[in-house]
């Protein structure tokens, strides 16, 4: 697994460097997770032909994966920092069950899948420190998550491959949208 942010060789070589700001830490954390997603996708794409499927074909699924919408205040038009931050945190919390599902889906990249999951937890903590309105953040219901996990794990092999691909692709797009929004904060 790659070295977590803040622990790369450049940091070791430059101990007197200015500590990262909150925004820089968040930026670095998201980039780290996106690199992890790329590595996981290499394994899934080598194993199945899901990666050749068009976005439209993949959209025809019953997974309720978090997605940015106009009302979330993360886009340039109608941008709202607090509403957007709440959406990013809520979305990441909703992705956690899907990241848990990914844990047993990789052979050679098992460590990488764990690193993506753990780094996301850290990212949520970073963002919660930044948010002013923590009351607006709704945490997913553990019972609902548990039954969703059971349902996903009970799918046939083809559907599990499709689900894995969809989760990684959607998570990537959500993180990219988050990073674009955070660039304005």
């Amino acid at each position: 697994a790659p070295v977590p942010p803040g622990e790369d060789s450049k940091d070791v070589a430059a101990p007197h460097r200015q500590p990262l700001t909150s925004s820089e830490r968040i930026d670095k954390q998201i980039r780290y997770i996106l690199d992890g997603i790329s590595a996981l996708r290499k394994e899934t794409c080598n194993k199945s032909n899901m990666c050749e499927s068009s976005k439209e074909a993949l959209a025809e699924n019953n997974l309720n994966l978090p997605k940015m919408a106009e009302k979330d205040g993360c886009f340039q038009s109608g941008f709202n920092e607090e509403t957007c931050l709440v959406k990013i945190i809520t979305g990441l919390l909703e992705f956690e069950v899907y990241l848990e599902y990914l844990q047993n889906r990789f052979e050679s990249s098992e460590e990488q899948a764990r690193a993506v999951q753990m780094s996301t937890k850290v990212l949520i903590q970073f963002l919660q420190k930044k948010a002013k309105n923590l009351d607006a953040i709704t945490t997913p219901d553990p019972t609902t998550n548990a039954s969703l996990l059971t349902k996903l794990q009970a799918q046939n092999q083809w559907l599990q491959d499709m689900t894995t691909h969809l989760i990684l692709r959607s998570f990537k797009e959500f993180l990219q949208s988050s990073l674009r929004a955070l660039r304005q904060m």
Partner: antibody, heavy 124, light 108 residues
Framework: QVQLQESGPSLVKPSQTLSLTCTVS????????VGWVRQAPGKTPEWLGG???????SYNPALKSRLSITRDTSKSQVSLSLRSVATEDTAVYYC??????????????????WGRGLLVTVSS | QAVLTQPSSVSKSLGQSVSITCSGS??????VGWYQQLPGSGLKTIIY???SRPSGVPDRFSGSKSGNTATLTISSLQAEDEADYYC???????????FGSGTRLTVL
């Protein structure tokens, strides 16, 4: 050094499919994305679409129904296919490398190195 | 689709500084690129990711952004800077790009 080279037919008949290949060197397609841009004579450039380092595609909505972008990482090639061409598709077609940061933000149009371009004329 | 507005032409004397602006509602949340096209030549990146310069591009060229306006600044103008300059930024929602109408720079 980083290089991109477009290749394909210079003349395509109306209603046919325009197929171009971009061969890259000096970088890996699993580390950088590649985009396609065209410029009709005397006009402003137009972003067609791109493929990122994960193999995800992004298309100009106005051309999405006719456009297809694929890659072959083992050959370091990215291909563009534009169906049902008309005379308005006559342009210089460029492939270009997306900047490294573009992957993180999804800014796939943000390119740092260009190919020399290939003039494609659509005519019967 | 997003629209980017650039002045159609700008003229400045040799050795002077010039600023070319690019305005559009999407610039605030997206990276901006600046591309140079010398007469009869292909496109070349002068600035990418709003303010980064590719290797080989002189440091006389710089890029910046404030709100919904991006600016390309060229200091101590040289004759070889005479060209068309295009800006490009993101077209929100589809990760695609949109180009400005272009600015013709004339070095007097």
């Amino acid at each position: 050094q980083v290089q991109l080279q477009e290749s394909g037919p210079s003349l395509v008949k109306p209603s046919q499919t325009l197929s171009l290949t971009c061969t890259v060197s000096g970088f890996s397609l699993t580390s950088y994305g590649v985009g396609w841009v065209r410029q009709a004579p005397g006009k402003t450039p137009e972003w067609l679409g791109g493929i990122d380092r994960d193999g995800d595609m992004s298309y100009n909505p106005a051309l999405k129904s006719r456009l297809s972008i694929t890659r072959d990482t083992s050959k370091s090639q990215v291909s563009l296919s534009l169906r049902s061409v008309a005379t308005e598709d006559t342009a210089v077609y460029y492939c270009a490398r997306s900047s490294y940061d573009s992957h993180y933000y999804g800014d796939y149009y943000d390119v740092d190195v260009w190919g020399r371009g290939l003039l494609v004329t659509v005519s019967s | 689709q997003a629209v980017l507005t650039q002045p159609s032409s700008v003229s400045k004397s040799l050795g002077q500084s010039v600023s070319i602006t690019c305005s559009g509602s999407n610039i605030g949340s997206s990276a901006v690129g600046w591309y140079q096209q010398l007469p009869g030549s292909g496109l070349k990146t002068i600035i990418y990711s709003t303010s980064s310069r590719p290797s080989g591009v002189p440091d006389r060229f710089s890029g910046s952004k404030s709100g919904n306006t991006a600016t390309l600044t060229i200091s101590s103008l040289q004759a070889e800077d005479e060209a068309d300059y295009y800006c490009a930024t993101g077209d929100r929602g589809n990760y695609g790009g949109v180009f400005g109408s272009g600015t013709r720079l004339t070095v007097l």
